[in-house]
Amino acid sequence: VPTATLVRVVGTELVIPCNVSDYDGPSEQNFDWSFSSLGSSFVELASTWEVGFPAQLYQERLQRGEILLRRTANDAVELHIKNVQPSDQGHYKCSTPSTDATVQGNYEDTVQVKVLADSLHVGPSARPPPSLSLREGEPFELRCTAASASPLHTHLALLWEVHRGPARRSVLALTHEGRFHPGLGYEQRYHSGDVRLDTVGSDAYRLSVSRALSADQGSYRCIVSEWIAEQGNWQEIQEKAVEVATVVIQPSVLRAAVPKNVSVAEGKELDLTCNITTDRADDVRPEVTWSFSRMPDSTLPGSRVLARLDRDSLVHSSPHVALSHVDARSYHLLVRDVSKENSGYYYCHVSLWAPGHNRSWHKVAEAVSSPAGVGVTWLEPDYQVYLNASKVPGFADDPTELACRVVDTKSGEANVRFTVSWYYRMNRRSDNVVTSELLAVMDGDWTLKYGERSKQRAQDGDFIFSKEHTDTFNFRIQRTTEEDRGNYYCVVSAWTKQRNNSWVKSKDVFSKPVNIFWALEDSVLVVKARQPKPFFAAGNTFEMTCKVSSKNIKSPRYSVLIMAEKPVGDLSSPNETKYIISLDQDSVVKLENWTDASRVDGVVLEKVQEDEFRYRMYQTQVSDAGLYRCMVTAWSPVRGSLWREAATSLSNPIEIDFQTSGPIFNASVHSDTPSVIRGDLIKLFCIITVEGAALDPDDMAFDVSWFAVHSFGLDKAPVLLSSLDRKGIVTTSRRDWKSDLSLERVSVLEFLLQVHGSEDQDFGNYYCSVTPWVKSPTGSWQKEAEIH
């Protein structure tokens, strides 16, 4: 238990802590408390262990909660006696009844408690506490009386505390040892002497505030505690608090007024007055700031300070601006040689500063005026703008030219210049609002900026913006497209030269719109194909003509493409379309996908008339079967030798169909030597079988090609090794290793490939590909489908 005597005052709470250490027993210890008044034996008071431990006298106080034990840890407990009385003075013994199995050390300890009469008196006793109303910057003081009539030597400690709503804070404290503790935020004011605590007479404690701040508002309490020195240690024996006063800080009245609207002619002086109204007549000093904003809101970021008069009456201002004051309540802003950029909103911002200790100042009030709206009037240029179309397109790709003319009644002034902006607006198809699109805009320095719509075309030279004469701006579209149809208008801006040689836009005049339009009918293109000689057999010549007619196409020329739709072997696949031959609008012929080397001159396409074309195919073969069409494109001339595609159309089909029941060919590969060792001869046979119609061997011929996928490149495409055409000519591919190849026809339907002196690179998978040729009754050779 504590070593020193505990001193308490009647009516306060007595708390005695007790803890046990260095024991071997259970971690949670039990505690017994007993009490002895002066000279008498100890009486059981309370126990954490035995319910029946306390004497009857204390049982009742325990039940009432006047006495209680509070465990603070496994090895510690506190005895609480609320509302302590003189009869509670004496010795209190704390013991641990069950600490160890064997006795080691002390298992009890005793502390003396003295109970003193309450002799501390704290005032004032006024109820309710008075209310003090003052203004910021004014002084105030509060008093608290505190005295102790204790026969013992006691010291008093005192704290001034302010409550503001639910929040409270310490203002200034005096400890029992005579030290001062300024509260949070009061340090500077305490050190400067603005907030002080001193004694008046023997029992009054005065809190003095030389200059009140708005933060000083609240309810002030004085908290007094009494301390006693026992065996060299100070202990607090009691504490009392009293409500002293409520301090209300009246905000200072401050208003700043400026004229509402002012109009001033360009080049003249702007004189604005700020009149201040305040209820402060003491030693406050004003700080006046004039600021300017384009918007009627001084808090916006665009606001800038023009001039400031600080509290020492020093003026800080920007060029062309002066600030002066006629008296303490009237402040003038003078802006010389005003120009258009001086139009806007002017504000007068006033702060009142009150002096503090050590030459410090603090703001006691501030106000911002309503804006003074200033309009700078100028003799604006007077001019009209006329737009007319000097070139109107009749068709797409024709040029358009617009002239925007300024008719100026007073254009002789050197300090006015004109620029143009061009706009486009689509023709309305409904009541929908159609926004204008900027084509180009010219700045005051005559630099031209393109809008999104025109940027690319201006760079390509298709849109040309120019100034032909001093009073005319031109806009030319080299090739007008259908998308360019619509309304065009120009806006001419007048720019006025400022005193700093910059140019400021002073006026915009809009032209009436000009509508660029031509009747737009859809281009029509019709192509009719016919076959003059409808019946023919394989080997004969196929002829077809295509006749073209068009409407709403300016000066058309035609290009023609002959295409064939070939049936594919399996019925589920779409037919294959092959482009055969074409003729462009300049009558240049080009073979498209005509790959039959033996019939290079087998197809002809010619222009018979401006609108008629003829296609011929000589020595037709069964493989030519299919649907043939003309695809015609109409072209319109643009800018000399250039052409624009106007329309494309496809003719009706003409069919080539051969009624044949020819043979069916199959091919297979066989080898007598599927497994060899390096150096052996490899023999591979390509064997053809024929089903269906019996054919004379002289009426059959074959193109045979051998391919291999070598074992060193199984993921690669097959490589052509050697081929033998129907005329018996053998072609062999170049090889990078030493083995040799030979290919020969060993019978009518058998072809032998031999690899001599085989090497590792020759091992792999071999394929043969066969294209049969069959002689038709007319004597022409017909190429059959390739087989593998």
């Epitope: 704290l159 929040a167 409270r168 404290a173 509260g183 009061y186 340090e187 933060a215 505690s225």
Partner: antibody, heavy 121, light 107 residues
Framework: QVQLQQSGPELVKPGASVKLSCKAS????????INWVKQRPGQGLEWIGW????????NYNEKFKGKASLTVDTSSSTAYMELHSLTSEDSAVYFC??????????????WGQGTTLTVSS | DIQMTQSPASLSASVGGTVTITCRAS??????LAWYQQKQGKSPQLLVY???TLAQGVPSRFSGSGSGTQFSLKINSLQPEDFGSYYC?????????FGAGTKLALK
């Protein structure tokens, strides 16, 4: 909602200086003190000082005078703490925290997430 | 400077249990004391100020008491989210100082 957003972690060399920021949102910035608190790894908390944004008034713990400088930019609602002549002893997490009732009540209801400062060569 | 001494430095308890953490000031601080909770890697959170006033949004199982130099924080019916470190801090005069902390662990 009230938020104090602190700048990211810093790795600086001994002897250098570093400026930490604390951006406030969700309340009137100028009416509440911003306090700065230091916490070394696995240790307790140390109060560095406070700054009142309305007038830029500051109060420093004597221990951090000359080590820390508190400043404010009211236009961006941001408080700053610059630490000078850094040593390994300055390696810590630094928190900014808002005064509960406004100015100089000395207990803090909203805290930044903390900025970790590592001083190492 | 006012020293704040917290005890115990660490303790373990079970969910549903009750714990009391104490804090002693080296001199009288009246009732200018705050309590904070801090979880690992997070910022502290205010629980109590003015020794016994619960901060906004703090559950009523937390309670603060004491004045002068002796203070305590009591947590009834412990919840899983209550485990972490607890710090006391005086807000009486400058410099503000904190206790060394009490680590509350799950038993």
């Amino acid at each position: 909602q009230v938020q104090l957003q602190q700048s990211g972690p810093e790795l600086v060399k001994p002897g250098a200086s570093v400026k930490l920021s604390c951006k406030a949102s969700g309340y009137t910035f100028t009416t509440y003190d911003i306090n700065w608190v230091k916490q070394r790894p696995g240790q307790g908390l140390e109060w560095i000082g406070w700054l009142y944004p309305r007038d830029g008034n500051t109060n420093y713990n004597e221990k951090f005078k000359g080590k820390a400088s508190l400043t404010v930019d009211t236009s961006s609602s941001t408080a700053y703490m610059e630490l000078h002549s850094l040593t390994s002893e300055d390696s810590a997490v630094y928190f900014c925290a808002r005064d509960y009732y406004g100015s100089t009540y000395g207990y803090f209801d909203y805290w930044g997430q903390g900025t970790t400062l590592t001083v190492s060569s | 400077d006012i020293q704040m001494t917290q005890s115990p430095a660490s303790l373990s308890a079970s969910v549903g249990g009750t714990v009391t953490i104490t804090c002693r000031a080296s001199e009288k601080i009246y009732s200018y004391l705050a309590w904070y909770q801090q979880k690992q890697g997070k910022s502290p959170q205010l629980l109590v100020y003015d020794a016994n006033t619960l901060a906004q949004g703090v559950p009523s199982r937390f309670s603060g008491s004491g004045s002068g130099t002796q203070f305590s924080l009591k947590i009834n019916s412990l919840q899983p989210e209550d485990f972490g470190s607890y710090y006391c801090q005086h807000h009486y005069v400058t410099p503000l100082t904190f206790g060394a902390g009490t680590k509350l662990a799950l038993k």
